[in-house]
Amino acid sequence: ITQQDLAPQQRAAPQQKRSSPSEGLCPPGHHISEDGRDCISCKYGQDYSTHWNDLLFCLRCTRCDSGEVELSPCTTTRNTVCQCEEGTFREEDSPEMCRKCRTGCPRGMVKVGDCTPWSDIECVHKESGTKHSGEVPAVEETVTSSPGTPASPCS
């Protein structure tokens, strides 16, 4: 996911919709004016705000990267929602990119969880039921590791 514009110095012309702040705050979908007297609407598809705020600028909408699908567009009150394409997933510890799901489990393991946009397939040992940690590119039928990609340890 990338920011639409990381150079906020080039501010767009003020929008037309204005109202007065309530106790110094503007409603979702707005930001506060430079003199604090008005609430100015965010621009649909360009920026947004989700809460009552005293932000001087609305937050920039994010754009979905290639490899992602847009689940819902950016509105003035909600950011774009992006999701990894089918067959890929995003881990919590590396949210900046979608990674390919494994196509199968190593020998001696069975699949107990499918590839989802937020998780790789889940493999467990046939006998013990212990989960497998780490990536193994080899599928059950093909157990050879490629050079430089040793099979990872199981927990």
Epitope: Q3, L6, Q9, N53, D54, L56, F57, L59, R60, T62
Partner: nanobody, 128 residues
Framework: EVQLLESGGGEVQPGGSLRLSCAAS????????MGWFRQAPGKGREFVSA????????YYAESVKGRFTISRDNAKNTLYLQMSSLRAEDTAVYYC?????????????????????WGQGTLVTVKP
Amino acid sequence: EVQLLESGGGEVQPGGSLRLSCAASGSTFSSLDMGWFRQAPGKGREFVSAISRSGDNIYYAESVKGRFTISRDNAKNTLYLQMSSLRAEDTAVYYCAVDTQPTYSGGVYYPRYGMDVWGQGTLVTVKP
């Protein structure tokens, strides 16, 4: 507790330049998101410019864009506002401020009107 001390104000003719400084103490300067505001005689507070702790995100009010430049020197614990092409309407007390509750989204800093730590201000007067 952060303490801020502005300097560099004074009287200047229209079209002239000034550089304001804001020295900060009592906190790790490089972790502060900061801004400049001003208050003209008989008017309310107005946002001028803001800068993120890293200096990567910079904002300006429409009225000063292209004339004012905000910068910071984290080694010297100092925030600057270079003002050029000054106009009569720039006459105001200029305040340095710290945003102690900064908003970050996607790694980008967004300044607030209600920055909550202020210096005592420095007066800038622009007149022929």
